[in-house]
């Protein structure tokens, strides 16, 4: 028979034949042959693989480093990674929760709607038209654009949500 060029789901192609992938929680020890099945072995303690795979090494569980304010939210299994979270009152810097901050900052273009408390993180809001924020801050609100008119000046450059307007002198009409 013709050697296969593609295999079924949960199989992989090697040496012109289809072998079964190892199930989640197990790693590949040896590929299948004409006469033998794929050989897989369970991941060790503190290791995991979360997909059907042909990996020869399991991944290490994530370490929730207490020096970074991290603690274990959910212990890893042979099929799942450990999930970290931050100590009470602290907040993850990303979805992956690799480090902790006391509160998040609002990026340029956003202002602080509510300053963080012991129980809630900073609440940011986009700067509306007529307001801007050019800094990353955990306490500053959006600031209103400068009013050129009150300074007897004209707008030379329009403001954005991240920049103030630029004012300049009015053009004098020549006689």
């Amino acid at each position: 028979p013709e050697p296969p060029t593609a295999c079924r789901e949960k199989q992989y192609l090697i040496n012109s034949q289809c072998c079964s992938l190892c199930q989640p929680g197990q790693k590949l020890v040896s590929d299948c042959t004409e006469f033998t099945e794929t050989e897989c072995l369970p991941c060790g303690e503190s290791e995991f693989l979360d997909t059907w795979n042909r990996e020869t090494h399991c991944h290490q569980h994530k370490y929730c480093d207490p020096n970074l304010g991290l603690r274990v939210q959910q212990k890893g299994t042979s099929e799942t990674d450990t999930i970290c979270t931050c100590e009470e009152g602290w907040h993850c810097t990303s979805e992956a929760c690799e480090s902790c901050v006391l509160h998040r900052s609002c990026s340029p273009g956003f202002g602080v709607k509510q300053i963080a408390t012991g129980v809630s993180d900073t609440i940011c809001e986009p700067c509306p038209v007529g307001f801007f924020s050019n800094v990353s801050s955990a306490f500053e609100k959006c600031h209103p654009w400068t009013s050129c008119e009150t300074k007897d000046l004209v707008v030379q450059q329009a403001g954005t949500n991240k920049t103030d307007v630029v004012c300049g002198p009015q053009d004098r009409l020549r006689a």
């Epitope: 304010g69 931050c86 901050v101 509160h103 900052s105």
Partner: nanobody, 116 residues
Framework: EVQLLESGGGLVQPGGSLRLSCAAS???????EMWWVRQAPGKGLERVS?????????YYADSVKGRFTISRDNSKNTLYLQMNSLRAEDTAVYYC?????????WGQGTLVTVSS
């Protein structure tokens, strides 16, 4: 490596004053928003005050408004907190922090005890 060293704490009577300092190194101090936070015995961290990089804008918790003043000297890489009209409830360890206020980026703190 970011280092923040707080000093100036001590024992003071109610109504008294103290000036806390925070010496910063390992980062460009003038580029960062800075915070003072405090932790009273058996309590969580409380945000006390903040100041923008230029020292032109400030924030104060309601509990310290009108009594505490935050300032900074960018030429000396130092943050200050002038505390007046101190009360028993101001007793806490005071910490300074740079924004973003990371868990691994804050100092040992300085203890302020307000008692008669």
């Amino acid at each position: 490596e970011v280092q923040l060293l707080e000093s100036g704490g001590g024992l003071v009577q109610p109504g008294g004053s103290l000036r806390l300092s925070c010496a910063a190194s390992g980062f460009t101090f003038r580029d960062y928003e800075m915070w003072w936070v405090r932790q009273a015995p058996g309590k969580g961290l409380e945000r006390v005050s903040a100041i923008n990089p230029q020292g032109t804008r400030t924030y104060y918790a309601d509990s310290v408004k009108g009594r505490f003043t935050i300032s900074r000297d960018n030429s000396k890489n130092t943050l200050y907190l002038q505390m007046n009209s101190l009360r028993a409830e101001d007793t806490a360890v005071y910490y300074c922090g740079k924004e973003p206020f990371r868990y691994d980026y804050w100092g040992q703190g300085t203890l302020v005890t307000v008692s008669s």
